[in-house]
C-alpha cells in the first residue's frame, strides 16, 4: 500500500440484473486495472418503501470520489438509486446512507446486504 493506502484487490460482487447481463448473481470479483490506476469497490441500491434492494456491487476503477474512503457511504440526499464506493478488499460488503444535511445526528444505520427475493 502506498502511504498506508488500502489496496483493493477484490470486491463483493452482486448483480440483480444478472440474467439480462449474463453474469453470476453473486460472488467475489477480482479487481483489475492499469498499475497507475487506483481500484475501488462500490455498491448501488434502491430503497423501496423502506426495503433495501441491492442493484449492483463490484469493482470500480480509479474515481477520485472514492479515494481514501474505507467505508462505503452514500451522502447524496434521497437519490433515486444510491451509490457508494470505497477502498480496501471487500469494503462494499456493508454500505450505508448518511446524507450531508444540516443535522448532527446520522439518519440511518449501516446496511448489511441481503439479496432481494427472487421467485
Amino acid at each position: 500500500a502506498i502511504l498506508g493506502r488500502s489496496e483493493t484487490q477484490e470486491c463483493l460482487f452482486f448483480n440483480a440484473n444478472w440474467e439480462k447481463d449474463r453474469t453470476n448473481q453473486t460472488g467475489v470479483e477480482p479487481c483489475y486495472g492499469d498499475k497507475d490506476k487506483r481500484r475501488h469497490c462500490f455498491a448501488t441500491w434502491k430503497n423501496i418503501s423502506g426495503s433495501i434492494e441491492i442493484v449492483k456491487q463490484g469493482c470500480w476503477l480509479d474515481d477520485i470520489n472514492c479515494y481514501d474512503r474505507t467505508d462505503c457511504v452514500e451522502k447524496k440526499d434521497s437519490p433515486e438509486v444510491y451509490f457508494c464506493c470505497c477502498e480496501g478488499n471487500m469494503c462494499n460488503e456493508k454500505f450505508s446512507y448518511f446524507p450531508e444535511m444540516e443535522v448532527t445526528q446520522p439518519t440511518s444505520n449501516p446496511v448489511t446486504p441481503k439479496p432481494p427475493y427472487y421467485n
Partner: antibody
Framework: EVQLLESGGGLVQPGGSLRLSCAAS????????MNWVRQAPGKGLEWVAG????????GYADSVKGRFTISRDNSKNTLYLQMNSLRAEDTAVYYC?????????????WGQGTLVTVSS | DIQMTQSPSSLSASVGDRVTITCRAS??????LNWYQQKPGKAPKLVIY???SLASGVPSRFSGSGSGTDFTLTISSLQPEDFATYYC?????????FGGGTKVEIK
C-alpha cells in the same frame, strides 16, 4: 503502450460470413473485458458485443444476437467477432475496444477500426 | 434498453468559448456515464468516465458532472483541437448504449 489492431474486414455479399480479429498488445489482455463497437457511414456509435476477461460472460446487441459470436484467445492476446448471415445494415467500421470491469464498461482504448461492407 | 439523448446535436463555437453538452438517460444510471471524443476518420477517445472522472491524458479543461438521469460535459475554454463529435454512453446495463452525438464546429 496499449495497442489494438483490427483485421478481417472487407466486402462480403448479403448472407455471407466474416471473421474479425483484434490483436492486443501493451497490457495484460487476460485481465480486461473487450468489446466490439461499430459505426455505420455518417452515423453514430453502436455497441455490438462484449466479453469479460476470461470469456465467462458475453453480451450482444439485439441487432446481432444469434448472428454474431464474440470470443477471445487469451493465449494469443486476440479478440474475435464471427459474423454470420450478414445484412446490408451491418455495413460499418468495426472497432475493438478495451473495457474495464464487466459491469462498468467505459472503453478506454480503441483500435483504428476495420471496414465491413455488405453488398451484392 | 436504456435510451441516451444528447443535446444539442450540433453547435458552433469559437476558440476560448465555454461549451456545455448534455446527455439524458431514459432511467437512472447512477454514475455509469462516459464521454468520448471522435474526430473524422479516427477512433473515439475516452474523455470522461464514471460521470466525473477525467481519463488519462485528457486536459483539465474537460469536466463532467451529473448523476441519475442528467449529465453534462463541459469544456471550459475551447481549443482548436477540441472541434470534434462527442458521444455519451451508459454502462449501467447491457446493451451498452450511446447518445446520438454532438458535433462541435468552428463558428
Amino acid at each position: 503502450e496499449v495497442q489494438l489492431l483490427e483485421s478481417g474486414g472487407g466486402l462480403v455479399q448479403p448472407g455471407g460470413s466474416l471473421r474479425l480479429s483484434c490483436a492486443a498488445s501493451g497490457f495484460t489482455f487476460s485481465s480486461y473485458s473487450m468489446n466490439w463497437v461499430r459505426q455505420a457511414p455518417g452515423k453514430g456509435l453502436e455497441w455490438v458485443a462484449g466479453i469479460n476477461y476470461n470469456g465467462g460472460y458475453k453480451g450482444y446487441a439485439d441487432s446481432v444476437k444469434g448472428r454474431f459470436t464474440i470470443s477471445r484467445d487469451n493465449s494469443k492476446n486476440t479478440l474475435y467477432l464471427q459474423m454470420n448471415s450478414l445484412r446490408a445494415e451491418d455495413t460499418a467500421v468495426y472497432y475493438c475496444a478495451r473495457g474495464a470491469n464487466w459491469h462498468d464498461t467505459h472503453l478506454d482504448y480503441w483500435g483504428q477500426g476495420t471496414l465491413v461492407t455488405v453488398s451484392s | 434498453d436504456i435510451q441516451m439523448t444528447q443535446s444539442p446535436s450540433s453547435l458552433s463555437a469559437s476558440v476560448g468559448d465555454r461549451v456545455t453538452i448534455t446527455c439524458r438517460a431514459s432511467q437512472s444510471i447512477v454514475r455509469y456515464l462516459n464521454w468520448y471524443q471522435q474526430k473524422p476518420g479516427k477512433a473515439p477517445k475516452l474523455v470522461i468516465y464514471a460521470a466525473t472522472s477525467l481519463a488519462s491524458g485528457v486536459p483539465s479543461r474537460f469536466s463532467g458532472s451529473g448523476s441519475g438521469t442528467d449529465f453534462t460535459l463541459t469544456i471550459s475554454s475551447l481549443q482548436p483541437e477540441d472541434f470534434a463529435t462527442y458521444y455519451c454512453q451508459q454502462s449501467y446495463e447491457l446493451p451498452l448504449t450511446f447518445g446520438g452525438g454532438t458535433k462541435v464546429e468552428i463558428k
